[in-house]
């Protein structure tokens, strides 16, 4: 999240790849309209919120890390888009350490937003248990906040 400038960044990213949605009727890669972007954000929001709430209940007292910044919005395109390629590695990294079922659903949605052939970086989770928990919490909080700001921007007038 944490590109507070211009929450609509996420807005059109969804112009993108929908491998999971069968059929030649699909718009080609990169080409989903804001309406479909919004649909996918609506699917992601409860997954992200639920995952965060469950983690906070399970891991009470864990602080947010000030060393982790999830750059979930790009600034290099107009309109800006969700930087799925930057977010996915984090979710792949925390998958073994969190609710795999929900993480898989989030990854599935993020994959739909991803531009084809965009490289993903490798992310390593901190080895220290406490730092690891703090890292996971931070990712979940920042991603949830990112989705909220983007959704607000999608609802605040013309896209």
């Amino acid at each position: 999240m944490l590109s507070h400038t211009g929450p609509s960044r996420f807005a059109l990213f969804l112009l993108c790849s929908m491998e999971t949605l069968l059929s030649s009727h699909m718009a080609p890669t990169h080409q989903l309209p804001p309406s479909d972007v919004r649909k996918i954000i609506l699917e992601l929001q409860p997954l992200s919120r639920g995952l965060l709430e469950d983690y906070q209940k399970k891991e009470t007292g864990v602080p947010e890390s000030n060393r982790t910044l999830l750059l979930c919005l790009t600034s290099d395109s107009q309109p800006p888009r969700l930087n799925s390629s930057a977010i996915l590695p984090y979710f792949r990294a925390i998958r073994p350490l969190s609710d795999k079922n929900i993480i898989d659903k989030i990854i599935e949605q993020l994959d739909k937003l991803k531009f084809q052939h965009e490289p993903e970086t490798e992310i390593s989770v901190p080895a220290d248990t406490f730092e690891c928990k703090s890292f996971i919490l931070t990712i979940l909080q920042q991603f949830s906040a990112c989705l909220e700001s983007v959704f607000k921007s999608l609802n605040s007038g013309p896209q």
Partner: antibody, heavy 118, light 111 residues
Framework: EVQLVESGPSLVKPGGSLRLTCSVT????????WNWIRKFPGNKLEYMGY???????DYNPSLKSRITISRDTSKNQYYLQLNSVTTEDTATYYC????????????WGQGTLVTVSS | DIVMTQSPASLSVSLGQRATISCRAS??????????MHWYQQKPGQSPKLLIY???NLESGIPARFGGSGSGTDFTLTIDPVQADDVATYYC?????????FGGGTKLEIK
């Protein structure tokens, strides 16, 4: 072959609630997006909202305070409820499938005429 | 909301001639070269039937006499040659932005 069939009361009193059912065969409502659209007597079409494969709903802001779309996956049916109806809600109501992102509504029900009158 | 303006409201065409229906959106419905504009045919007593999706793609099973063109804000549905079976009301619809919106319809009659 995908088929959608609307059913429900054809007459509703002003101030009451309209509840329609869309029964789907040939596809599962746990994939794709399932929509309601209505056509007014003057032939104007209005998009009302959808329920998604996961149960997420989204509504036309013009109806948001009055509309609820729900579903029963065991029956492969989804529903439209419209509250506080007036004569302005008299229309033919259609259910329709939006199967793929970036596509269009490819299967529609035959429509059911609902008249709001006392 | 994106306002869709269709013209003409009604059209009378001789059998075998060309029918042209226009649809104008109040703002562009294009994204990365794709136009999220669709055309439907509704015959009396029937439900709408998808003819053209994304401006120019012919839906499966629809005769090649139907064609769609346009981009941005201006779109056209062409039927050439018109047959008796084409008597219907034709609607354009945008799925670019929520809420989805429709044109007012064009009623096609045979001269």
């Amino acid at each position: 072959e995908v088929q959608l069939v609307e059913s429900g009361p054809s007459l509703v009193k002003p101030g009451g609630s309209l509840r329609l059912t869309c029964s789907v065969t040939g596809d599962s409502i746990t994939s794709g997006y399932w929509n309601w659209i209505r056509k007014f007597p003057g032939n104007k079409l209005e998009y009302m909202g959808y329920i998604s494969y996961s149960g997420i709903t989204d509504y036309n802001p013009s109806l948001k305070s009055r509309i609820t779309i729900s579903r029963d996956t065991s029956k492969n049916q989804y529903y439209l409820q419209l509250n506080s109806v007036t004569t302005e809600d008299t229309a033919t109501y259609y259910c329709a499938r939006y199967g793929n992102y970036g596509y269009a509504m490819d299967y529609w029900g035959q429509g059911t005429l609902v008249t709001v009158s006392s | 909301d994106i306002v869709m303006t269709q013209s003409p409201a009604s059209l009378s065409v001789s059998l075998g001639q060309r029918a042209t229906i226009s649809c104008r959106a109040s703002e562009s419905v294009d994204t990365y070269g794709n136009s999220f504009m669709h055309w439907y045919q509704q015959k009396p007593g029937q439900s709408p039937k998808l003819l053209i999706y994304r401006a120019s793609n012919l839906e499966s099973g629809i005769p090649a006499r139907f064609g769609g063109s346009g981009s941005g804000t201006d779109f056209t549905l062409t039927i050439d040659p018109v047959q008796a079976d084409d008597v219907a009301t034709y609607y354009c619809q945008q799925s670019y932005e929520d809420p989805w919106t429709f044109g007012g319809g064009t009623k096609l009659e045979i001269k």
